[in-house]
């Protein structure tokens, strides 16, 4: 999970650094998880499609009082061009399945790494 080869580059910090940091934060969360993440809180599952950054934020923003994902919540706001508020539900959600935050984080991490392998990052 920690192998993020290809991210390092000399010179000015590229915009993709933000993405590297998001992936690394998700890795940290999955690796450092001892007790159930966010006390086993459940969030809406999302479609891991083109709107996933906003969808992920929309789902996770409804989890409060969980310091483990606060940084992820802040970071995702940098990837979502739209305003996202707690309690908001747009067409981004499947909204028929709820999963634990820990599983949500793992799914998001795997998808981001898959996109990276496919060369989807500039």
């Amino acid at each position: 999970l920690t192998c993020l080869g290809g991210f390092a580059s000399p010179g000015p910090v590229p915009p993709s650094t933000a993405l590297r940091e998001l992936i690394e934060e998700l890795v940290n969360i999955t690796q450092n998880q001892k007790a159930p993440l966010c006390n086993g809180s459940m969030v809406w599952s999302i479609n891991l499609t083109a709107g996933m950054y906003c969808a992920a934020l929309e789902s996770l923003i409804n989890v409060s009082g969980c310091s483990a994902i606060e940084k992820t919540q802040r970071m995702l706001s940098g990837f979502c061009p739209h305003k996202v508020s707690a309690g908001q539900f747009s067409s981004l959600h499947v909204r028929d399945t709820k999963i634990e935050v820990a599983q949500f984080v793992k799914d998001l991490l795997l998808h981001l790494k898959k996109l990276f392998r496919e060369g989807q990052f500039n």
Epitope: S16, K83, L115, E118
Partner: antibody, heavy 120, light 109 residues
């Protein structure tokens, strides 16, 4: 009715500046990411820039980076494109477009466009 | 930057016929592909998002398919109002850079 109306186009000499405006109505402008897209006469579409709902992030096409600046005034429901050091190849119809909430790839609402001609 | 190549450049068909438009990406864009229709003197109109989902108000005769690098827009039975230019478009995952294909002109035979 959801609407975007561009203005500010015209004829300008190379090296000069121009500011385009896009007035939004019929939706909560302050909640949406917005874009500028252009189309040279008889040519295809070219993405120019994106701005976050609150102006916190902005990204540009390489062809305009360092010369164009996208901005917005949410209190006026208006999107702007400041174009400096204009070149002949910037001649195009400029469209503002709303980034669809359901899909970060798709532009669901477009303005009618405003023509910018760069010529000496 | 991911390059999108559309083919054919021009497609000449008659009303009632089936139109198949192709868009090929220089590298995988997963399913993050969008199709637009543009008529002369008008702004583009969103047709298909995520490669295969019809936007609101788009007739069922329009369908999209494909993933990875090869995508297709199919119009099952052409109506007179369908003759226009069609563009495919994608976004790199990060930073957000948007690319359009060069367009396919669908004209009346």
């Amino acid at each position: 009715e959801v609407q975007l109306v561009e203005s500010g186009g015209g004829v300008v000499q190379p090296g000069r500046s121009l500011r385009l405006s896009c007035a939004a109505s019929g939706f909560t402008f302050s909640s949406y990411g917005m874009h500028w897209v252009r189309q040279a006469p008889g040519k295809g579409l070219e993405w120019v820039a994106i701005i976050w709902y609150d102006g916190s992030n902005k990204y540009y096409a390489d062809s305009v980076k360092g010369r164009f600046t996208i901005s917005r005034d949410n209190s006026k429901n208006t999107l702007y494109l400041q174009m400096n050091s204009l070149r002949a190849e910037d001649t195009a119809v400029y469209y503002c477009a709303r980034l669809w909430f359901g899909d970060l790839d798709a532009f669901d609402i477009w303005g009618q466009g405003t023509m910018v001609t760069v010529s000496s | 930057e991911i390059v999108l190549t559309q083919s054919p450049a021009t497609l000449s068909l008659s009303p009632g016929e089936r139109a198949i438009l192709s868009c090929r990406a220089g590298q995988s864009v997963s399913s993050y592909l969008v199709w637009y229709q543009q008529k002369p003197g008008q702004a583009p109109r969103l047709l298909i998002y995520d490669a295969s989902n019809r936007a609101t108000g788009i007739p069922a005769r329009f369908s999209g398919s494909g993933s990875g690098t090869d995508f297709t827009l199919t119009i099952s039975s052409l109506e007179p109002e369908d003759f226009a230019v069609y563009y495919c478009q994608q976004r790199s995952s990060w930073p957000p850079v948007y690319t359009f294909g060069q367009g396919t002109k669908l004209e009346i035979k």
